[in-house]
Interface confidence: medium
């Protein structure tokens, strides 16, 4: 599923991401935009043999199990395919673990490069939340 901007903002808010670990909702919507272009079925392969999955591009080396990433830790204890569902529950729950891990949203390269320090509230402007 490819979410609309405000549709995703509402879904993320419903799942408790607004101000989760101090990150406003705009940060999460911005991250999703630049990680997956709001596409729940996005997959991207990395040079280390891992793959990133879903709307927040969660990595198979650390966070989920795709059955083929050497040394996968599967810290979210889920199959990576669950992160590709049109229901973002699994992605949000795993993202909460990731953002709690110490580096905050710096874990997402796209957030670091494209969202951090910008007017992220623009990503939820005009949305009825």
């Amino acid at each position: 599923k490819v979410f609309g901007r405000c549709e995703l903002a509402a879904a993320m808010k419903r799942h408790g991401l607004d101000n989760y670990r101090g990150y406003s909702l705009g940060n999460w919507v911005c991250a999703a935009k630049f990680e997956s272009n709001f596409n729940t079925q996005a997959t991207n392969r990395n040079t280390d043999g891992s793959t990133d999955y879903g709307i927040l591009q969660i990595n198979s080396r650390w966070w989920c199990n795709d059955g083929r990433t050497p040394g996968s830790r599967n810290l979210c204890n889920i199959p990576c395919s669950a992160l590709l569902s049109s229901d973002i529950t699994a992605s949000v729950n795993c993202a909460k673990k990731i953002v709690s891990d110490g580096n905050g949203m710096n874990a997402w390269v796209a957030w670091r490069n494209r969202c951090k320090g910008t007017d992220v509230q623009a990503w939820i402007r005009g949305c009825r939340l």
Epitope: Q41, T43, R45, G49, G67, R68, P79, S81, L84
Partner: antibody, heavy 115, light 107 residues
């Protein structure tokens, strides 16, 4: 137990297309990538590409882009590979395998003859 | 693409001999190297995964070693059922690639 059952041998004319199937049983089909591998005598094994049935995500070896197309039907736990514009170079045994990094589970192979 | 070169192309041995098959990668692939055996008209069968991990049901005479670019499959005291083709495969990067194979034949 995990099994991958491929469709039977095919004899096709040059220029035609063929669709090979791979039915998976014994595991959660949507969770694992399905890989496709080509084997020609004297040419060893070649990785064609892969599909993740749960999402339809596909990746192709550059060499096979435009030649192979992968699809999957999650209702029947079956992956498909269509090969188009067939030539004698496409005559080979085609295998599906479950993409575990290493390929522990293989189909029995589908022999394609283009003549 | 990562190229895998297997040597020798053919190995003629007598049952009871011990042999080593080589697989060399064109760049480092860490330990992401797997070995398969294939008999005529059969699908490949996984022998060793991630350089040295023996798969379940594989006889203990098969072992693997190496890292980086140089890998070895060893068969301690070859049995008649071991004859066939042996392929290595890397899963370090895409596209996945296979070696050209080593044919193990009876002398």
């Amino acid at each position: 137990q995990v099994q991958l059952q491929e469709s039977g041998a095919e004899v096709m004319k040059p220029g035609a297309s063929v669709k090979i199937s791979c039915k998976a049983t014994g595991y959660t089909f949507t969770t694992y990538w399905i890989e496709w591998v080509k084997q020609r005598p004297g040419h060893g094994l070649e990785w064609i590409g892969e599909i993740l049935p749960g999402s339809g995500s596909t990746y192709y070896n550059e060499k096979f882009k435009g030649k192979a197309t992968f699809t999957a039907d999650t209702s029947s736990n079956t992956a498909y590979m269509q090969l188009s514009s067939l030539t004698s170079e496409d005559s080979a045994v085609y295998y599906c395998a479950r993409g575990d990094g290493n390929y522990y589970y293989w189909g029995q192979g589908t022999t394609l003859t283009v003549s | 693409d990562i190229e895998l070169t297997q040597s020798p192309a053919t190995l003629s041995v007598t049952p009871g001999d011990s042999v080593s098959l080589s697989c060399r990668a064109s760049q480092s692939i860490s330990n992401n190297l797997h070995w398969y055996q294939q008999k005529p008209h059969e699908s490949p069968r996984l022998l060793i995964k991630y350089t040295s991990q023996s798969d379940s049901g594989i006889p203990s005479r098969f072992s693997g070693s190496g890292s980086g670019t140089d890998f070895t499959l060893s068969i301690n005291s070859v049995e008649t059922e071991d004859f066939g083709m042996y392929f290595c495969q890397q899963s370090n990067s895409w596209p996945r690639t296979f070696g050209g194979g080593t044919k193990l034949e009876i002398k």
